[in-house]
Amino acid sequence: MAVTACQGLGFVVSLIGIAGIIAATCMDQWSTQDLYNNPVTAVFNYQGLWRSCVRESSGFTECRGYFTLLGLPAMLQAVRALMIVGIVLGAIGLLVSIFALKCIRIGSMEDSAKANMTLTSGIMFIVSGLCAIAGVSVFANMLVTNFWMSTANMYTGMGGMVQTVQTRYTFGAALFVGWVAGGLTLIGGVMMCIACRGLAPEETNYKAVSYHASGHSVAYKPGGFKASTGFGSNTKNKKIYDGGARTEDEVQSYPSKHDYV
């Protein structure tokens, strides 16, 4: 039950996170005009990954797309790439995790397959979240660098006679959405990985060969260990051994209802 809850919660958290990453990537407010300690302009500038916008004092907003690919800063291209990779990995992760959910039955899919899929999606979510966090952080670093450069320019007067109204940019809403969304996706991924441990058998199953001192009989135990399926009394996944010597017959064996002696 706890495994199902952890897996389900991980899926939901990742879903919210990926939706947030998509929202952040599409948002125009990655950087917004700094209004503090600046000449008050009648226009408000803000920029996204795909276009820049200007809002007039009347409320009229005009946005222009970046219709060049080669003319854009390499850092911006890198941020775009990181965000897209994050979205793609997250989307694939979501698709995989839907089929991995314990509460959803698809044919005769075994728990081990679901465990593997849960782990795969978990890793994908972790990488997706890291991509988003990295992308947003790279952009934030770029903003901080440019902010202090333009602040320095403001106070050195650009060395000329004519003053310019320096437009400085600060963190936009999209950065915070991206950080939170990346964090949620990361947390969701970790939860999926934790859920995977609960889905998969913890140790390798054994068939034990018992040798008794009297030599009267040899007992084979095909049910090397009893999984917690509600059968028998062994609900703690403890191994059942008879006697001394043991031989490993199979890599994987399935829980059995009865012990054959």
Epitope: A42, V43, N45, S57
Partner: antibody, heavy 119, light 113 residues
Amino acid sequence: LVQLQQPGAELVKPGASVKVSCKASGSTFTTYWMHWVKKRPGQGLEWIGGIRPSDSNTNYNHKFKGKATLTVDKASSTAYMQLSSLTSEDSAVYYCAMGAYYSNSFAYWAQGTVVTVSA
Amino acid sequence: DIVMTQSPSSLTVTAGKKVTMNCKSSQSLLNSGNQKNYVTWYQQKPGQPPKLLIFWASTRESGVPDRFTGSGSGTDFSLIISTVQAEDLAVYYCQNDYVYPFTFGSGTKLEIK
């Protein structure tokens, strides 16, 4: 068609106050900024300030802070400018102008109110 | 405050001729966000309120004759009347509508011979 109506003239005594009105018709009053501009004889135009009727957000020229107070009455689509502690320096033509939607320029102007400060 | 300096303060031209008036701002009025210059030109005829001619330095307001052309960028702007007509007798003002407080130039008075 947008129309702005102002009273033609106001005669006031020094030290007194005057409230100049500007009634808008033919457009959505709340959408656009209402600006006030001063024009003294033989001098240029001076921007006093502007008010956005939708939220009563104001922007003043620091030269007129304390002198002019801008208000709006959305119900009657009227903007007001109150001038206080009047002196002869305040004798001028006062225009109200409606801001354009697409830019910050003043698209529509009223005929202006001549304010004369005289004892 | 941004100072808008207009030149000449007055000029007299013959009808049909081309005229250019200038406006210089103390700060750049170019907005980097949209590469637009926030300069507006107004025409004020005697006994009338000002009339919007050109905004964003070069965009003609609807209904304004195409003989009026605005140009310039950064700090230097011009208003050109390609063929002056008798009805163009007026004072022309440039305005900074980028940085508060909005400021006007002192005006250029156009007289017709």
